[in-house]
């Protein structure tokens, strides 16, 4: 806590401007008028006060508004905003695009930071839902932002904001993510013509249901590989070779390369070796001719 | 890409002055403060002076106050230490410097200019 | 705020961890920052408070601390990292340089 002194003569500040560098941590604690600090934030930023500083004004402002600073305020922290515990935050009532891109802006280059993480949530909590401009938003400053947010939370993500997605905000999203996400793409996408939906579905596959790999492998798509690779491995266990040779198309002949690996491994032990010796491709591992494969899951439904 | 350079430094007598100059280029100079920081021989660094923006607010280290005037002329890019009443100890390698806002750091420098104050 | 710098000098081969340290005074929060000076050159920013790595810094340089006591570490040696460094605060006016670290080949 700064101690409360008198504001020696002719120091008492009438604007926020460069002078104040040169006020002592007493000084400005003395001479500053809250109030004016409140209209004149924007002036801040083009100020270099040091973090002793910074941390007396911050201070001024939790003084003046305990129960939270005023979105007029929070618009305008800019570098202060650095300053702010999540706690500090959680006090806040942000309900502008505006002010939380204003935010991320001083934020820009870094990882998400708790501060950060908290505003997000509490703008997120204020609207309802994940809209598709905030989603805009937050992709454009956090690329990963999509895949930290749990599958409960990406269930209030309408289909239309969907749009907004890019195929890198999903890199880091693991298979349940994909899994919610998968059908708003497939319903915010459904109006697309073959080639033109594939493009656009192809980075939330990790998501598809068999019958629509299925589908897809009817429309002359020739998915890459890496798209492949990261497949449900239930969805790609019941496809046929003649199906997985259709959706792949020609990068059939990357198949030789990740056969040790999922989810083609697996696929491999479930295909009868003669099946697989049609792609030419020395596939080993599959059913050996003469065997007889009993699908104990449809056994089990039927009883 | 951010470019500075000095001039000016060179030897000169205990008592006499000098004039150093730096030109910079490769952004908008008037949006920044500005630093003169310097490097005595084999020593440390040591922060001399900073100019704002605008230049209507000037720091100097107390080692200089009095001796040192720091100015800008924004129109020419160029930053200015005009160094008076130069002493011994003032032998240095001069830096200018770009300063951030947030935070307060130096984050482009010049080659610096050396400045020899000998009899 | 003065700063001290340990060791003044070390000795390191390729491949070596190193650790510098920069002690303040007083208590600088998080207000520090690390510069690299190689003979003849003007030195470079490295990090910034306490521990955000400068834009085009290689990630084996890395900081750490809060308060008073703040680590320099640069996780392993390569030729172009013989140098000086330097710490800085901006906590509080007049901004300082500790009396730097000079890495040297063993």
């Known amino acids: 806590e700064v101690e409360k002194t008198a504001c020696p003569s002719g120091k008492k500040a009438r604007e926020i401007d460069e002078s104040l560098i040169f006020y002592k941590k007493w000084e400005l604690e003395a001479c500053v008028d809250a109030a004016l600090l409140a209209t004149q934030m924007d002036r801040v930023n083009a100020i270099p006060f040091t973090y002793e500083q910074l941390d007396v004004l911050k201070h001024k402002l939790d003084e003046l508004y305990p129960q939270g600073y005023p979105e007029s305020v929070i618009q305008h922290l800019g570098y202060l905003f650095l300053k702010m515990s999540p706690e500090d935050i959680r006090k806040w009532n942000v309900t502008s695009l505006e002010t939380l891109k204003a935010l991320l802006e001083v934020n820009k280059g870094h990882e998400m930071s708790p501060q950060v993480a908290t505003l997000i949530d509490r703008f997120v909590k204020g609207r309802g839902q994940l809209d598709k401009d905030t989603l805009d938003t937050l992709t454009a400053f956090y690329p990963g932002y999509l895949c930290s947010l749990s599958p409960e939370e990406l269930s209030s993500v309408p289909p239309s904001s969907i749009w907004a997605v890019r195929p890198q905000d999903l890199d880091t999203c693991d298979p349940r993510q994909l899994d919610v996400l998968y059908p708003k793409a497939r319903l915010a996408f459904q109006n697309m013509n073959g080639s033109e939906y594939f493009v656009k579905i192809q980075s939330f596959l990790g998501g598809a249901p068999t019958e629509d790999l299925k589908a897809l492998s009817q429309q002359n798509v020739s998915m890459d590989l890496a798209t492949f690779m990261k497949l449900r491995t239930d969805a790609v266990l019941p496809l046929t070779v003649a199906e997985v040779q259709k959706l792949l198309g020609p990068h059939v002949e990357g198949l030789k390369a990740e056969e040790r690996h999922r989810p083609v491994r697996d696929w491999i032990l479930r295909q009868r070796q003669d099946d697989l010796d049609t792609l030419g491709l020395g596939l080993q591992g599959g059913i050996p001719n003469g065997y007889l494969v009993l699908d104990l899951s449809m056994q089990e439904a039927l009883s | 890409q951010v470019q500075l350079v000095e001039s000016g430094g060179g030897l000169v007598k205990p008592g006499g002055s000098l004039r150093l100059s730096c030109a910079a280029s490769?952004?908008?100079?008037?949006?920044?403060?500005m630093s003169w920081i310097r490097q005595a021989p084999g020593k440390g660094l040591e922060w001399v002076s900073y100019?704002?923006?605008?230049?209507?607010?000037?720091y100097y280290a107390d080692s200089v106050k009095g001796r040192f005037t720091i100015s800008r002329d924004n129109a020419k890019n160029s930053l200015y230490l005009q160094m008076n009443s130069l002493r011994a100890e003032d032998t240095a390698v001069y830096y200018c410097?770009?300063?951030?806002?947030?935070?307060?750091?130096?984050?482009?420098w010049g080659q610096g200019t050396l400045v020899t104050v000998s009899s | 705020i003065q700063l001290t710098q340990s060791p003044s000098s070390l000795s390191a081969s390729v491949g070596d961890r190193v650790t510098i340290t920069c002690r303040a005074s007083?208590?600088?929060?998080?207000?520090l920052a690390w510069y690299q000076q190689k003979p003849g050159k003007a030195p470079k920013l490295l990090i910034y408070?306490?521990?955000s790595l400068e834009s085009g810094v290689p990630s084996r340089f890395s900081g750490s601390g809060s308060g008073t006591d703040f680590t320099l570490t640069i996780s392993s040696l390569q030729p172009e990292d013989f140098a000086t460094y330097y710490c800085?605060?901006?906590?509080?006016?007049?901004?300082?340089f500790g009396g730097g670290t000079k890495v040297e080949i063993k």
């Open positions: 410097a770009r300063d951030l806002i947030f935070p307060v750091v130096f984050d482009y």
């Open positions: 490769g952004f908008t100079f008037s949006d920044y403060y």
């Open positions: 100019i704002s923006s605008s230049g209507s607010t000037i």
């Open positions: 007083q208590g600088i929060s998080s207000a």
């Open positions: 408070d306490a521990s």
């Open positions: 800085q605060q901006f906590n509080s006016y007049p901004l300082t």
